[in-house]
Interface confidence: low
Amino acid sequence: PRSIEVKYIGVKSAYVSYDAEKRTIYLNITNTLNITNNNYYSVEVENITAQVQFSKTVIGKARLNNITNIGPLDMKQIDYTVPTVIAEEMSYMYDFCTLLSIKVHNIVLMMQVTVTTAYFGHSEQISQERYQYVDCGRNTTYQLAQSEYLNVLQPQQ
């Protein structure tokens, strides 16, 4: 079998809300993946599991099941959203993210994603990690592949 390629494109949008009482930030982060099937037979994308880390702490997880079928030599773009919560021991970030005196409130998040594909009863997992800037101070939509990132793409340990 030929390879199935997973390419993390970046953050498509980040929608932010706050709970001032508990100094908590809620970030709904929508990411975009390109999945390319280089085989001459179709492949099922069984699930996508994703998690987001801030400062080595997992702040959000998501799982999509029974996503799509990718035809032979075809590519599909898939968006997935990870709801994240920055709270508790990281609530000091509330002050940074709500500070009115600065325009861009970028924080560095690590996006981790694992795509599970299946064909002929065989299952394959492909994982990627990417450090990404996200603005926690306002709702932001990004041009695909235009969102700022730190180029530290590496396979999941």
Epitope: A20, K22, S91
Partner: antibody
């Protein structure tokens, strides 16, 4: 040590306004919420609202919107609550409070001394 | 508003006795961030309230270990294992999960 010192008792006439103060000491005033709590004689406690002195943002219990106005003066590390259009229902002890020690865990672990407001003609 | 109902209103005890105060919320007070902000305060006559327990079961600094909190969802309990004279006063539960934050009506712990 961390303290919230409130202004003295007030005797005011119905329909008038009163402004009571809460002076913070022993910590960085701009970094912690100041809450206000009402206690009528022989009754329980009611949360009025909070102010975050660092940016002046406030949040009120709907019940006290229009009745209470919260402000803060960072230069003197003092929070204020103004009560308007006073009636006998507003006669109470008013406390300021702050979540200094447990900022991420609890609401009121430092309390002011309380200010008694009596509304009487 | 979330109604916090405390029982009993009055709790007569002898020194050294065990005491238990119940607090029931009108709806679940699990905050959207997963925590339950249920607190217990003690107010002695002529004094400001003092924090005893936060997030259901955590004793605040300096609070004796004879005080313990438990519960989940809508039902919460404060227990005092051996009542001492300094424990007398009015106990309030409080929820900080849903605005407006609300207190229970209070339970007066007094000598039998």
């Amino acid at each position: 040590q961390v303290q919230l010192q409130q202004s003295g008792p007030e005797l005011v006439k119905p329909g008038a306004s009163v402004k009571i103060s809460c002076k913070a000491s022993g910590y960085r005033f701009t970094s912690y919420y100041i809450h206000w709590v009402k206690q009528r004689p022989g009754q329980g406690l009611e949360w009025i609202g909070w102010i975050y002195p660092g940016n002046g943002i406030t949040n009120y219990n709907e019940k006290f919107k229009g009745k209470a106005t919260l402000t803060a003066d960072t230069s003197s590390s003092t929070a204020y609550m103004q009560l308007s259009s006073l009636t006998s229902e507003d006669s109470a002890v008013y406390y300021c409070a702050s979540p200094y020690y447990g900022i991420r865990n609890c609401y009121f672990d430092v309390w002011g001394t309380g200010t008694t407001v009596t509304v009487s003609s | 508003d979330v109604l916090m109902t405390q029982t009993p209103l009055s709790l007569p005890v002898s020194l050294g006795d065990h005491a238990s105060i119940s607090c029931r919320s009108g709806q679940s007070i699990v905050h959207s961030n997963g925590n339950t902000y249920l607190e217990w305060y003690l107010q002695k006559p002529g004094q400001s309230p003092k924090l005893l327990i936060y997030k259901v079961s955590n004793r605040f600094s300096g609070v004796p270990d004879r005080f313990s909190g438990s519960g989940s969802g809508t039902d919460f309990t404060l227990k005092i294992s051996r009542v001492e004279a300094e424990d007398l006063g009015i106990y309030y539960c409080f929820q900080g999960s849903h605005v407006p934050w609300t207190f229970g009506g209070g339970t007066k712990l007094e000598i039998k």
